[in-house]
Every structure is written in C-alpha cells, then in structure tokens.
C-alpha cells in the first residue's frame, strides 16, 4: 500500500500524545477546580477535536472553536484578571503564588492548550504529527493561532474591574501591537465593565532604574485605552525576583520599600 501524500508545513507537527494530554489535563483541572466538576472531559475533547479534524489547517475560523468555548465557559471575579505579553513564565509564577488572580492559562481552555501544537488534515480524520502551519511562513488562520485568538478575545471580553497586564520591559517594544495582548485583548476590554488597565512593566537588568512607564510604546497603550474611556495606570517592577518574594511574604521588612 502506498503511503498517502501529506501536506508539508513549515511549523513543527502536533505535540506527541496530543489527545491523551488534553484529556488528562482536563481531568486534572476539573478535579482541582470544584466549580468545573460538572464538565465532561470526553465532550470537551470531542469539541476540541471537532474544531480542527478533517479541516484544511489554513482555513480555521473562530466559529470552529465555539462549541469548545461554550463547554469551557468560566468567569473570573472582577479585579482578578492578569493579562501578559512576552513574559509568560513570570505571570504564571505570580498567579501560582497569588492564587486569587488568573491568567488565561489558569482557566480550563488555556490550561488544556498551553505549550501544545496541533493540526489535522483536510478530509481525513488523522492528526498531523509531522508538521503544522507556521503563523508567518504558512498562514495565520491555523488551528493553534485561531484557538488562542478566540480564547484570548473571550478572556478579555469577560474581564471586569481593574485589569492587570504584565509587560516585558527588556524588549524593544514593551507594548507590541503584534502580540496577542496588543492585537486582540486590548481591543476587546469592555469599557462598561473595565474601569482601569494597570500595566506592570517588568525590568530585566538589576541596575535598570529607568522609568519604563514613560516608554513611547506605553504611552501608545495609554492612548489606545484612553479613547475607550478606560483609565490607565502603570507601575515599574524594578526587581521581579523581589516582587515575587514579596507576594509570597508580604510581611517581610524588605518588602516595605519599593520593588
């Protein structure tokens, strides 16, 4: 039997044991989060699979993910949403300590897909473990990119109160319009629900005492937010290590001085 011809994409293929990983993560999440115990993980996997299996992987739409989004509906309490851009690890370390704040990856759908890659093939029920479309080299409407765009939009739309965002002060563009935060989340915050956006600019160098809140890209962010009648605040986090330490131990005497 001749092997079937398979489309070659520029990106890495589906993460090995993808179905098992998603299912296992779902079971683990629903066990740890009582408010999600009602979720049927087999239905979640079926909805996830249905979004990309048998579909041309450069023609995926947000509509494809709606059944999955519906099953994974979750609300974050007001003032507890943490967005991030180009500084995922620190954001996740923070919410692991500050358990009442949530990034997208602390929610069911984000948790399921974090760090995974997946895609299918047109007209077959197979998962492509060899290659998947690369956002730049192949197409932007691929299963992974569309998934994150869909769930990021929803996450931003449902945020309320004061929303926080962690930004990487070591990058040339601290606020980058091409990031998920810059292209999706910032435009989907709802002014009737969100009073303010507070940016935490995380410094990289120990000796870096500049006020990165005065960076032109941060002023750009304020300009975008201001037109939507959402207040904007910005804080420099000069010492991220100390910042995390002080979240863990706020009573520590060294935490009374600036971080």
């Amino acid at each position: 039997v001749l092997p079937r011809w398979r489309q070659q994409w520029s990106g890495s293929g589906t993460t090995s044991r993808f179905p098992e990983t998603v299912l296992a993560r779902c079971v683990k999440y629903t066990e740890v989060h009582p408010e999600m115990r009602h979720v049927d993980c087999q239905s979640v996997w079926d909805a996830f699979k249905g979004a990309f299996i048998s579909k041309y992987p450069c023609n995926i739409t947000e509509e494809d993910y709606q059944p999955l989004v519906k099953l994974g509906t979750q609300t974050v309490p007001c003032n507890k949403t943490l967005l991030w851009s180009r500084i995922k690890d620190l954001a996740h370390q923070f919410t692991q300590v500050q358990r009442d704040m949530f990034t997208l990856e602390d929610m069911l759908l984000g948790y399921l897909a974090d760090d995974l890659t997946w895609c299918g093939e047109f007209n077959t029920f197979e998962i492509n473990y060899q290659s998947c479309p690369d956002w730049r080299k192949d197409c932007s409407n691929n299963p992974v990119s569309v998934f994150w765009k869909t769930v990021s939009r929803r996450f931003a739309e449902t945020a309320c109160g004061v929303v926080h965002v962690m930004l990487n002060g070591s990058r040339s563009k601290i606020f980058d319009k091409n990031s998920t935060f810059g292209s999706v989340e910032v435009h989907n915050l709802q002014p009737e629900k969100v009073q303010a956006l507070e940016a935490w600019v995380i410094h990289g160098g120990r000796e870096d005492s500049r006020d990165l809140c005065q960076d032109p890209t941060i002023k750009e962010l304020e300009s975008i937010i201001s037109k939507r009648n959402i207040r904007f605040f910005c804080k420099n986090i000069y010492r991220p290590d100390k910042f995390l330490q002080c979240v863990k131990n706020p009573e520590d005497s060294s935490c009374l001085s600036g971080i």
């Epitope: 032109p216 002023k219 750009e220 975008i224 939507r228 904007f232």
Partner: antibody, heavy 118, light 109 residues
C-alpha cells in the same frame, strides 16, 4: 506657544498627488498621537487619518484607505499626509490636530487648502 | 451620512439656554470618549468638552452630558459670540476611527 502649522496644499488634477506637512512646536510632539481632519467647502468635519506616538499604528477613514498614507518624523516634529490618486471629493481644508489622552483633539492647526480640479 | 447624528441647526436669544444633541451607538458614544468642538466662522475647530469635562479656558456656561448612546452639549446664558458650528465626535471601537456628527449651526437671534 503650542502650535501646529500645515503646509503643502494647492491645486492638483484628479489622479494627482500631494504631500501635506504639519510642523509642531511648543509641546513634546513625540508624546502625542496625531490626526488629519478635513472640511470640504460648506460641509462638516471629517476625520481622515491618525498615527500613534511611535508610528507603529495607523488608522484611516474608509474614504481614503489605500490612497492616503500618514507618517511622522519625531526627530523633526513633523506629521505628513501623502495623498495619491486624488479625487474631486478630496477637495477640502486639511487640519492636523494632536490627540491628548482622555481629552480629545486638543490643538489644531489653521489648515491648508487642497483643491482637486481639472 | 455621518455616523453621529446632530440637528443641523439650533437657535436661541441672548441669555437663553440651548441644548444640542448627538446620537450614536454602543461602539462609539456609549462606551468611548466623546468630544464637542466649537468652530467659529473662518477659524479652526476648538476643543470645548471632553466627555463631560471642560478644558481650562472654556467658560462654565458650556457643559456636556452623556446618557447611553447619546450625548448633549448645553450652553446657558447664550451670548452673541457663541454663534458658531458645533460638532460632536467620538472614537468608534468597531471602525477604529474617529467619527464626527454632521455639525449644528447655532444662531443667536
């Protein structure tokens, strides 16, 4: 004194091009989003285009998309509007205006007149 | 056809109070920044109201209000120098654009 001064207007034939400039003084130009707004003879104000502080974001009215290009030179404190494939309906006074966060278009120039006619 | 709707004209006698309305939608007036501009004959527009606030230098006879998808400009103690065109404007989040009303010509009788 805070000031915006437009230049570059004039008479041009349909299909022709013009480049408008707006020189800023008296404020930190690189701290402000900038806009072009036009007003056809005897008509109301129509927003044309905007550019963000660093120039990485640009916005256009549907009526000029694909024909006009907004740009800025923060080192020269100057805003530009490159207008190509001009039409009779582009005839107007073109104003540049800064955008002050939470306020609006705070400072306006006096305008430069563009006439598109054969 | 303007995205924001204003009455084309309004009038009043000196000392009177006049209100100019501006109607929009959820994607502009309801959720986003609203401005009012005054354009005296032969001059460039001037920022008069942002949301419901007055920039410094604008007399307190001018006031702005907003309710749902509509905004209003009120001028009390009308004076002859208030004769001008008044425009409302708002950022429209769906269009990613500033939108203006068609303008209201205020005549002081």
């Amino acid at each position: 004194e805070v000031q915006l001064l437009e230049s570059g207007g004039g008479l041009v034939q349909p299909g022709g091009s013009l480049r408008l400039s707006c020189a800023a003084s008296g404020f930190t130009f690189s701290d402000y989003e900038m806009n072009w707004v036009r007003q056809a003879p005897g008509k109301g104000l129509e927003w044309v285009s905007a550019i963000s502080i660093t120039g990485s974001w640009t916005y256009y009215a549907d009526s000029v998309k694909g024909r006009f290009t907004i740009s800025r030179d923060n080192s020269e404190n100057t805003l530009y509007l490159q207008m190509n494939n001009l039409r009779a309906e582009d005839t107007a006074v073109y104003y540049c205006a800064n955008y002050k966060s939470y306020y609006g278009m705070d400072v306006w120039g006096r305008g430069t007149t563009v006439t598109v006619s054969s | 056809q303007s995205v924001l709707t204003q009455p084309p004209s309004a009038s009043g006698t000196p000392g009177q109070r006049v209100t100019i309305s501006c109607s929009g939608s959820r994607s502009n007036i309801r959720n986003n920044l609203v401005n009012w501009y005054q354009q005296l004959p032969g001059t460039a527009p001037k920022l008069l109201i942002y949301n419901t606030q007055r920039p410094s230098g604008v007399p307190d006879r001018f006031s702005g209000s907003k309710s749902g998808t509509s905004a209003s400009l009120a001028i009390s103690g009308l004076q002859s120098e208030d004769e001008a065109d008044y425009y409302c404007a708002s950022w429209d989040a769906s269009l990613n654009a500033w939108v203006f009303g068609g303008g209201t010509k205020l005549t002081v009788l």
